[in-house]
Every structure is written in structure tokens, then in C-alpha cells.
């Protein structure tokens, strides 16, 4: 069985100011069993933007139903895009561990790129 | 298989305190978000308090908001709900129910209940 | 606050026969709906998650549709051992929230 690969087909998003963004992600695999989560930026300063396991993030939604067992789709909106949401964005799968979940792997990244709303 | 168990529950004056406790077992208590739920006699499901696997997150209803404490300690598989300045409103029985991975997802399991009685 | 208002409040049915129970959302909650039972004296049971998928040991006879802010449980043929109240329940965010239930009987 390959292993797992996640796909962040986009390199590049432009969106208007107030628009909604729409990040995708697919997995390749439904193993290993773990959570996705989206960030923005790399290395230890990332910002969480969703995490699949645990809280509710009000400006983000997820495009299919997460609740599925066999879904492999993590693609996500953002509302209400503002100059302060540029930045790029990681889709990264976590292994389920004991007491906590480990990375396992990442997309290659989507630019956002907002644009001012016209006058 | 899985089992949830609340206790603590019983009869107490308004404006005094109660702690339940909800113990888990049949599943790994710390991939799980957990949910008191409560149903006054004769009524229907209220949501009270939900807490993240991690407790990162944690939620209440504006009817206990201030006044009740949702906590866990996953080294010993508990739940807990802090009751403070009970009201007679407050009577009821108390679920805890588990809630696999993140927000969207539905109670897949829930406790017997344990009875709370507020009155003086 | 996500309202959920569920009709008819009690349903009578005839043993073999379709029951159906609505549940209507104050604003969409997408697919994230859920139907719980309780019958008397017992805790709720999950049957249905995300609107429309059976939880694993439900009988076929369960189902449901919907999304959005219109939702909906069948039970298919109406057994004796259905008699109880049924839930729907939001989490399309917080706070959930339940309807008021909807009691089937026999009839």
C-alpha cells in the first residue's frame, strides 16, 4: 500500500477583500488514522487556522463533511478574507498518538493573495 | 465495550455547590471530545457544557455560563462538571456523552444519567 | 443560537407503517444533523449522524434525509420496540442545540 500523500493542488489563491477563500486539500489514503489541521506559515511561529479534532473556528468551514468515515477530502473556506489573511497556507496530516497526535506530513503550501476591494 | 458512568449526582439546596464525574472505559478516553447533556423531568435534551479531547476547547450554554466548570483528567479517564450556585432550574438528569474528533461530530455514546434535585 | 423545531410534537403509527419526523433549523446547518431515540427511562441512543448516514448497528429500517434547514427521519415499518421520543440535533456550531422531540406511538 502507498503511503499517504497530501495534495494541495493550488499553489496560488486570489481573493477579494470580503470574499470567501477556498483552500483544497485531498489525502491519498485514509491511513494513518489521525487529524488534519490547517496552517498559516511553517516552523514553530504557524498559525492554527482548523483543527479537524478539536474546537469550532467561526470564519472556517470545511467543503465536505468531515463527520464521513471514508472522506479524504480537507479542503476548507475562509469568510470574510481580509489584507491580514494573506499569507500561505499548510494542509498537515497527524498521526494519532498516545497522549498526543504526531505530524506526519504536509501539503506543499497555497499562496493567498488578497486583493483590495475596489472603490 | 464502551461505558460511560456519571456520578455525584442528588438532592441539594439552591445556591449550594455539586460535582459530578463521569468515568469512562471500552475506548481511548483522550481521542474523544466529552459533552454533559442535561433533560429536566419530563422535558427534553439541553446541551450544558462540551470539552475538547485536549481541553484546548472548551463551551457552555448561557444558562450555566459562570456558574458551572466542565473539566477532564485523562490520566484516569474522567469527566467532571463543577455546579456551583445551583438553581431550582437546574434540576435534572445529567448525561455525559462522548463526541469523536472535532465539533461537527454527533454523541455516539451516552451515559445512564444521574439525577440532580435543587430544592430547599 | 441555532433554533430546531421538530413536527409534528407526537406521532401515532400503526405497527408496519411509515412514520416520518421533521425537523426544521432556523438557519442552515449543512449536513450536520443528527437523531438520537430515547425510549422511556433510558439514556438517548445515536441512529443517525450527518443527516443521512446509519450508525453502525441501527436497523435499515432508520433513515434520513435533508440538508440545509430542512431535515427529516423515517422509520420505514413502525415496530413495537420504535415506541420512543426522537431528537434532532445541530452542531453545524455552537451552542448545540436539540429540538423538543417528537413522541411515537402505536396507534
Known amino acids: 500500500e502507498e503511503e499517504l500523500q497530501v495534495i494541495q493542488p493550488d499553489k496560488s489563491v486570489l481573493v477579494a477583500a470580503g470574499e470567501t477563500a477556498t483552500l483544497r486539500c485531498t489525502a491519498t489514503s485514509l491511513i494513518p488514522v489521525g487529524p488534519i489541521q490547517w496552517f498559516r506559515g511553517a516552523g514553530p511561529g504557524r498559525e492554527l487556522i482548523y483543527n479537524q479534532k478539536e474546537g469550532h473556528f467561526p470564519r472556517v468551514t470545511t467543503v465536505s463533511d468531515l463527520t464521513k468515515r471514508n472522506n479524504m477530502d480537507f479542503s476548507i473556506r475562509i469568510s470574510n478574507i481580509t489584507p491580514a489573511d494573506a499569507g500561505t497556507y499548510y494542509c498537515v496530516k497527524f498521526r494519532k498518538g498516545s497522549p498526543d497526535d504526531v505530524e506526519f506530513k504536509s501539503g506543499a503550501g497555497t499562496e493567498l493573495s488578497v486583493r483590495a476591494k475596489p472603490s | 465495550q464502551v461505558q460511560l458512568v456519571e456520578s455525584g449526582g442528588g438532592v441539594v439546596q439552591p445556591g449550594r455547590s455539586l460535582r459530578l464525574s463521569c468515568a469512562a472505559s471500552g475506548f481511548t478516553f483522550s481521542d474523544y471530545g466529552m459533552i454533559w447533556v442535561r433533560q429536566a423531568p419530563g422535558k427534553g435534551l439541553e446541551w450544558v457544557a462540551s470539552i475538547s479531547s485536549s481541553s484546548s476547547y472548551i463551551y457552555y450554554a448561557d444558562s450555566v455560563k459562570g456558574r458551572f466548570t466542565i473539566s477532564r483528567d485523562n490520566s484516569k479517564n474522567r469527566l467532571y462538571l463543577q455546579m456551583n450556585s445551583l438553581r431550582a432550574e437546574d434540576t435534572a438528569v445529567y448525561y455525559c456523552a462522548r463526541r469523536y474528533y472535532g465539533f461537527n461530530y454527533p454523541f455516539d455514546y451516552w451515559g445512564q444519567g444521574t439525577m440532580v434535585t435543587v430544592s430547599s | 443560537d441555532t433554533v430546531l423545531t421538530q413536527s409534528p410534537d407526537s406521532l401515532a403509527v400503526s405497527l408496519g407503517q411509515r412514520a416520518t419526523i421533521n425537523c426544521g433549523a432556523s438557519?442552515?446547518?449543512?449536513?450536520?444533523m443528527h437523531w438520537y431515540q430515547q425510549k422511556p427511562g433510558q439514556q438517548p441512543k445515536l441512529l443517525i449522524y450527518?443527516?443521512?448516514n446509519l450508525e453502525a448497528g441501527v436497523p435499515s429500517r432508520f433513515s434520513g434525509s435533508g440538508s440545509g434547514t430542512d431535515f427529516t427521519l423515517t422509520i420505514s415499518s413502525l415496530q413495537a420496540e420504535d415506541v420512543a421520543v426522537y431528537y434532532c440535533q445541530q452542531s453545524n456550531e455552537p451552542p448545540y442545540t436539540f429540538g423538543q422531540g417528537t413522541k411515537v406511538e402505536i396507534k
Open positions: 450527518s443527516a443521512s
Open positions: 438557519k442552515s446547518v449543512r449536513t450536520y
